[in-house]
C-alpha cells in the first residue's frame, strides 16, 4: 500500500529574468527513492537517478541547475515558463508518487511565494 505523501512548494510566482527552486519532498513512507523525474506538461526537464546522478534535457541545459537535493533550480525565467511542473518520484517498493507545482512568471516585481501544500 502506498502510504507516502508528496509535499511541494505549491503555487509559486517569480519575476521574469529571475530564478526559482522547484522542490518536492516525499514523506510518510520508508520506500527507497530510486529516481526523480521533473516534467513540464509534455516535456522532460531533468532526471535524478539515485545511483547515476543527473540528466538534464537539452532544451533546459543552459538554464536548469540540478539541486538543491532532488529539487531543480530554473534560471533566466521567461513568461513562457508559466505553467505546471511535476515531480515524479519512482520508489521501491511503493511505486510512483507525483507532485504538482504551478509556476507563474510575472513581468513586474510583485512575485511572492505561495504556501506549501500536500498532495496525497
Amino acid at each position: 500500500m502506498m502510504t507516502g505523501t508528496i509535499e511541494t512548494t505549491g503555487n509559486i510566482s517569480a519575476e521574469k529574468g529571475g530564478s526559482i527552486i522547484l522542490q518536492c519532498h516525499l514523506s510518510s513512507t520508508t520506500a527507497q527513492v530510486t529516481q526523480v523525474n521533473w516534467e513540464q506538461q509534455d516535456q522532460l526537464l531533468a532526471i535524478c537517478n539515485a545511483d547515476l546522478g543527473w540528466h538534464i534535457s537539452p532544451s533546459f541545459k543552459d538554464r536548469v541547475a540540478p539541486g538543491p537535493g532532488l529539487g531543480l533550480t530554473l534560471q533566466s525565467l521567461t513568461v513562457n515558463d508559466t505553467g505546471e511542473y511535476f515531480c515524479i518520484y519512482h520508489t521501491y517498493p511503493d511505486g510512483t508518487y507525483t507532485g504538482r507545482i504551478f509556476l507563474e512568471v510575472l513581468e513586474s516585481s510583485v512575485a511572492e511565494h505561495g504556501a506549501r501544500f500536500q498532495i496525497p
Epitope: T34, Q43, A50, D51, L52, G53, H55, I56, S59
Partner: antibody, heavy 118, light 107 residues
C-alpha cells in the same frame, strides 16, 4: 574521445570474464559509462551504468547477479565482470559514454566479443 | 519494464525517398527517447536525442519527433550510406530499454 575495449574472449561455461574499457580524450570522471549487450544478429540490451566520480552504479535487474561494474580513475578505465557464464552470455559487449549531464549513449567502444563454449 | 515497439522490422526504400520509422512506448516516457544507427559490422551511433535534437555531426536529413508514447524518426532523403538498423531507446526509467530495431534496406 575514444573508448578502447579489450580483445575477444573465449571462455568456458561457469567461468568469469572481466572486460575493460579505457577512455581517452576527456575527463573520465565527468561522464557516466554504460554497458550494452548485443547477441549475434540480435538487438541491443542495456546492462547498467556507472558514475566514475563516485562509483555509483545502476543495473538492469536482469543483469544484477551477472555483471559487476567498477572503475579505476587513475587509468581512466571502466570494467565489467561477467560471472557464471552460459551460452546465453555469448555476445558483443559495448562500453558507451554519456553526454554531459546526459543519459544518451554518445560515444561507443568497438565492442568485445565474448564466446562461451566448452 | 517499458517495452519500446518498432512496428516494422524491415523497411525497403529507394535513394532519395523520404522514410519514417515509428516507435511506441508501452507507457509514458515524456521526451526521454533516443535514436541510434548501427551499420553492418559497426558499433551503434547516436543520431537523435530528446527526441528531436540532432547529435553533433549528424546530417540534417535525419530528424526526430514525439512525446509521451509515440515517436517518429525520419530520413528526408535516403542516401545509399543510410543502409543500417535503427533503434529507438528510452531512458525515462530504468531499466532503459531499446526497440527491436528497424532494418533499412535500399532497393
Amino acid at each position: 574521445v575514444q573508448l578502447q575495449e579489450s580483445g575477444a574472449e573465449l571462455v568456458k561455461p561457469g567461468a568469469s570474464v572481466k572486460l575493460s574499457c579505457r577512455a581517452s580524450g576527456y575527463t573520465f570522471t565527468d561522464y557516466f559509462v554504460y554497458w550494452v549487450k548485443q547477441r549475434p544478429g540480435q538487438g541491443l540490451e542495456w546492462i547498467g551504468g556507472i558514475n566514475p566520480s563516485n562509483g555509483g552504479a545502476t543495473f538492469n535487474e536482469k543483469f544484477k547477479n551477472k555483471a559487476t561494474l567498477t572503475v579505476d580513475t587513475s587509468s581512466s578505465t571502466a570494467y565489467m565482470q561477467l560471472s557464471s557464464l552460459t551460452s546465453e552470455d555469448s555476445a558483443i559487449y559495448y562500453c558507451t559514454r554519456g553526454n554531459f549531464y546526459g543519459y544518451e549513449f554518445a560515444y561507443w567502444g568497438q565492442g568485445t566479443l565474448v564466446t562461451v563454449s566448452a | 519494464d517499458i517495452v519500446m515497439t518498432q512496428s516494422h522490422k524491415f523497411i525497403s526504400t529507394s535513394v532519395g525517398d523520404r522514410v519514417s520509422i515509428t516507435c511506441k512506448a508501452s507507457q509514458h516516457v515524456s521526451t526521454a527517447v533516443v535514436w541510434y544507427q548501427q551499420k553492418p559490422g559497426q558499433s551503434p551511433k547516436l543520431l537523435i536525442y530528446s527526441p528531436s535534437y540532432r547529435y553533433t555531426g549528424v546530417p540534417d536529413r535525419f530528424t526526430g519527433s514525439g512525446s509521451g508514447t509515440d515517436f517518429t524518426f525520419t530520413i528526408s532523403s535516403v542516401q545509399a550510406e543510410d543502409l543500417a538498423v535503427y533503434y529507438c531507446q528510452q531512458h525515462y526509467i530504468t531499466p532503459w530499454t531499446f526497440g527491436g530495431g528497424t532494418k533499412l534496406e535500399i532497393k
